[in-house]
């Protein structure tokens, strides 16, 4: 079901032991409960339980308190799941009968016998806080409380709305008390099913498929990849993009390996000759008067 | 409510490939994950690949590198590419989507055999 009202039965009393004709139990009224809740009527009328009905054991003899007990017969508080959108507002019958029959059963018995019964109609809105009551009448009090609650996984203020949280593949979430999806941390996204990237991680050059990870697109490296792979056989030079060479000053051709400054470079003429560069690892000695040679050596 | 129908299994030789289709008809967004599960005889069904939102993926790790799934959301249809096939593939491909917020209301397909002999 997607909720269930639960009814917290907490004290009756019946001091002179008698029935709703008048008549006293012998030897005393034996205690059980009906209880029927169904949907909201300005007049209560007989028919069916809409929302649902329950029974109790004999719970007690004439006046008596109620324990709570979390299992088995005689369970309290009493449990009227629902599988429906709750829709705020009911009405429930609470009737107290005497048996002399059967104590786990009395509702099998013939012979039973009203003792009281109240009537309570009203609006109440899911949540966790119990609204307590208390109903007299000439012969007879009861106190009670009672409150909606969600069944595990239903969520919101009509208990219409169906979570329960997930770690897969199809999403890593939890669930906000209205129902909705809370990710997991490291994921976003509708069904919190995109890993959220290591922070910095470029956007476009970089993508992840799990949490605070960064793998790169081809032609990008870098923790954040953000940084140009250049082209495989680039010597001296950068990129901007990927695959590019883009030569250093002083380099040249494809793949900037042809030095364009070689006199800077390698320093080729001696005593204080002059260097001028002409292409490629091309380069000319002026020499100062009084030397010769290729370098101006001799 | 989401039917999920698949196709393009069959009978296919070691090293061989396949392309499975999954045709989804409802209400399916283009940020629903879509996905592909595998059963073999007396086994767990086991996650293969899925792909969600910006077209993420995700492989389980025997078929990273040979298996290859995609989306076309005009036609709300995953695919999964299959290449390079093992006899360890043979098993029945079930197409899923998930129901929002909730695993136990996950839509499967039918499923379709694949099965690969050596």
């Known amino acids: 079901g997607s909720g269930i009202f639960q009814l917290r039965l907490q004290e009756f009393v019946n001091q002179r032991g008698m029935l709703a004709n008048g008549q006293s139990c012998e030897p005393g009224c034996r205690t059980f409960f009906r209880i029927c809740l169904k949907h909201f009527q300005a007049t209560f009328s007989e028919g069916p339980c809409t929302f649902g009905n329950v029974s109790t054991p004999v719970l007690g003899t004439n006046s008596f308190v109620v324990r709570d007990k979390n299992s088995g017969s005689g369970r309290n508080p009493l449990q009227l799941p629902f599988n429906f959108t709750w829709p705020g507002t009911f009405s429930l019958n609470i009737q107290a009968w005497h048996t002399p029959g059967d104590d786990l059963r009395p509702e099998t018995s013939p012979g039973n016998s009203l003792i009281s019964q109240i009537i309570i109609q009203g609006s109440l809105a899911v949540g966790k806080i119990w609204r307590t009551d208390e109903q007299n009448d000439t012969l007879t009090r009861l106190s009670y409380s009672y409150r909606v609650i969600c069944s595990d996984n239903y969520y919101g203020e009509s208990c219409s709305r169906l979570c329960k949280k997930r770690d897969d593949h199809f999403g890593h979430y939890e669930c906000q008390p209205d129902g909705s999806l809370s990710c997991l941390p490291g994921w976003t996204g509708k069904y919190c099913d995109q890993p959220i990237c290591l922070s910095g991680c470029h956007e476009q050059n970089g993508y992840c498929s799990k949490p605070d990870e960064c793998i790169c697109r081809p032609g990008w490296q870098g923790r954040l990849c953000n940084e140009c792979i250049p082209h495989n056989g680039c010597r001296h030079g950068t990129c901007s993009i990927p695959w590019q060479c883009a030569c250093d000053e002083g380099w040249g051709g494809l793949f900037c390996d042809q030095d364009l400054n070689y006199c800077t470079h390698h320093s080729p003429c001696k005593n204080g000759s002059t260097c001028s560069n002409s292409g490629p690892k091309g380069y000319t000695c002026t020499c100062l008067p009084g030397y010769t040679g290729e370098h101006c050596e001799l | 409510q989401v039917q999920l129908q698949e196709s393009g299994g069959g009978l296919v030789q070691a090293g061989g490939s396949l392309r499975l289709s999954c045709a989804a008809s409802g209400n399916i967004s283009v940020w629903i994950p879509m996905g592909w599960y595998r059963q073999a005889p007396g086994k767990e069904r086991e996650f293969v690949a899925s792909?969600?939102?910006?077209?993420?993926?995700y492989y389980a790790d025997s078929v990273k590198g040979r298996f290859t799934i995609s989306r076309d959301n005009a036609k709300n249809t995953v695919y999964l590419q299959m290449n390079s096939l093992k006899p360890e593939d043979t098993a029945v491909y079930y197409c899923?989507?998930?129901?929002?917020?909730?695993?136990?209301?996950?839509?499967w397909g039918q499923g379709t055999q694949v099965t690969v002999s050596s």
């Open positions: 899923a989507v998930p129901y929002y917020g909730h695993s136990d209301y996950d839509y």
């Open positions: 792909i969600g939102e910006g077209s993420t993926t």
